[in-house]
């Protein structure tokens, strides 16, 4: 971790202890400079471990809407287009930060929250347990 | 998508227009009730589209450390353990929200920022363009 030298133009803050409340501008800055041409939104259909996207909405959360991946099959799609159960489709999960309204229903007061979301699926070799 | 009747105990806020500044408690609440036993951290090795994880650190960002996936091969690993270039390993990307210190170096003032991260890789059938 790197220590941040204080900018003299920062908003004043007396309490430097955790938990601490900070000010956040919700006007989102997009660092993804123009749409990535290599980024495809059809991988969920073309993957050997295809997935469906499910809509999850919670107005007490920011962002309110998150689309979650659910693998279509237990196995993976083989070269013939059939499901091969010798391989496993598994969700790739990521912990992300969201804002949770706190107290509830407040438009301008939040708490950081960590949630686990499934982003897509990948095909893995199963772990085989051999019984002695 | 559901709207929020104002809680009378909310911090006061006159301006409901974008952009708006809100208060955020950085004491993270973890909604992932105990670690999911099915969540495996070795998928990156067992996948037919394996990936490496690269550490990305930025002290002006919260969280300052993000681990990014980079696919190991252009192709996918076949049943013999060789790379099959008739299939493609591709990154599964997700847009996530992070906090960016604004003004820079301020410990208590942030702006929401959207960044694109690669979470893992999946094996897809390539799109073949036929030339007439």
């Amino acid at each position: 971790g790197i220590t941040i030298p204080r900018n003299p133009g920062c908003p004043n803050s007396e309490d430097k202890n955790f938990p601490r409340t900070v000010m956040v501008n919700l006007n989102i800055h997009n660092r993804n400079t123009n749409t990535n041409p290599k980024r495809s939104s059809d991988y969920y259909n073309r993957s050997t471990s295809p997935w469906n996207l499910h809509r999850n909405e919670d107005p007490e959360r920011y962002p309110s809407v998150i689309w979650e991946a659910k693998c279509r099959h237990l196995g993976c799609i083989n070269a013939d287009g059939n499901v091969d159960y010798h391989m496993n489709s598994v969700p790739i999960q990521q912990e992300i930060l969201v804002l949770r309204r706190e107290p509830p229903h407040c438009p301008n007061s939040f708490r950081l929250e960590k949630i686990l979301v499934s982003v897509g699926c990948t095909c893995v070799t199963p772990i085989v347990h051999h019984v002695a | 998508g559901i709207t929020i009747p104002r809680n009378p105990g909310c911090p006061n806020s006159e301006d409901k227009n974008f952009p708006r500044t809100v208060m955020v408690n950085l004491n993270i609440h973890n909604r992932n009730t105990n670690t999911n036993p099915k969540r495996s951290s070795d998928y990156y090795n067992r996948s037919t589209s394996p990936w490496n994880l690269h550490r990305n650190e930025d002290p002006e960002r919260y969280p300052s450390v993000i681990w990014e996936a980079k696919c190991r091969h252009l192709g996918c690993i076949n049943a013999d353990g060789n790379v099959d270039y008739h299939m493609n390993s591709v990154p599964i990307q997700q847009e996530i929200l992070v906090l960016r210190r604004e003004p820079p170096h301020c410990p208590n003032s942030f702006r929401l920022e959207k960044i694109l991260v690669s979470v893992g890789c999946t094996c897809v059938t390539p799109i073949v363009h036929h030339v007439a």
Epitope: L26, I28, N30, W67 | I2, I4
Partner: antibody
Framework: EVQLVQSGAEVKKPGSSVKVSCKAS????????IHWVRQAPGQGLEWMGV????????FYNQKFDGRVTITADKSTSTAYMELSSLRSEDTAVYYC??????????????WGQGTTVTVSS | DIQLTQSPSSLSASVGDRVTITCSAS?????IYWFQQKPGKSPKRWIY???ELASGVPSRFSGSGSGTDYTLTISSLQPEDFATYYC?????????FGQGTKLEIK
């Protein structure tokens, strides 16, 4: 200025398909879902489904029983709604509307001008 | 599906009148949305999250309610308010709208 501009009126035969477009401008296309709502002549509003241009996710009103397909093209900031196996009762004005993913309580805040689809033999 | 029933279906009133439109849900919902539509035009978001007026909506409009019963009130009717108003719920799929209340000049 936020705008959702829809394609022109269509006249279709029963059993055929129609594809309506909705071109967005004046905002970041991937920050908003696109919802589709239709209105039969002299009738109320009926929600058909949603597409998230960012993830490609879609969710449909089951009433349409697999006949509706909603897509989006991020490169042109255009959403599409295709309805197949058309019948006379699909004669309606079709609207697209945007919906902020980050704070859903704002609801469907901007709507397209509507596209009239007439199904007649 | 959650049914939304608006009352009345049509209403004749005069400029200056106080008007109330109700929307009753077949089961409890979290909030209601109201849209205004004029003939040949697209619906306009009018009231969101039960209480909040959309940008440009005059303060003579107000929204209230909870559970299954919601209302839109116009304190003093103006000529530009004559239109059809629809309530809308997003608490449960499929999202549904009321059948509409047509507000006409007496």
């Amino acid at each position: 200025e936020v705008q959702l501009v829809q394609s022109g009126a269509e006249v279709k035969k029963p059993g055929s398909s129609v594809k309506v477009s909705c071109k967005a401008s004046g905002y970041t296309f991937t920050d908003y879902e696109i919802h589709w709502v239709r209105q039969a002549p002299g009738q109320g509003l009926e929600w058909m489904g949603v597409n998230d241009p960012e993830s490609g996710g879609t969710f449909y009103n089951q009433k349409f029983d697999g006949r509706v397909t909603i897509t989006a093209d991020k490169s042109t900031s255009t959403a599409y709604m295709e309805l197949s196996s058309l019948r006379s009762e699909d004669t309606a004005v079709y609207y697209c509307a945007r919906y902020y993913r980050y704070e859903s309580f704002y609801g469907m805040d901007y709507w397209g001008q509507g596209t009239t689809v007439t199904v007649s033999s | 599906d959650i049914q939304l029933t608006q009352s009345p279906s049509s209403l004749s009133a005069s400029v200056g009148d106080r008007v109330t439109i109700t929307c009753s849900a077949s089961s409890s919902i979290s909030y209601i949305y109201w849209f205004q539509q004029k003939p040949g035009k697209s619906p306009k978001r009018w009231i969101y999250a039960t209480f909040e007026l959309a940008s440009g909506v005059p303060s003579r409009f107000s929204g209230s309610g909870s559970g299954t019963d919601y209302t839109l009130t116009i304190s003093s009717l103006q000529p530009e308010d004559f239109a059809t108003y629809y309530c809308h719920q997003r608490s449960s799929y499929p999202w549904t709208f009321g059948q509409g209340t047509k507000l006409e000049i007496k």
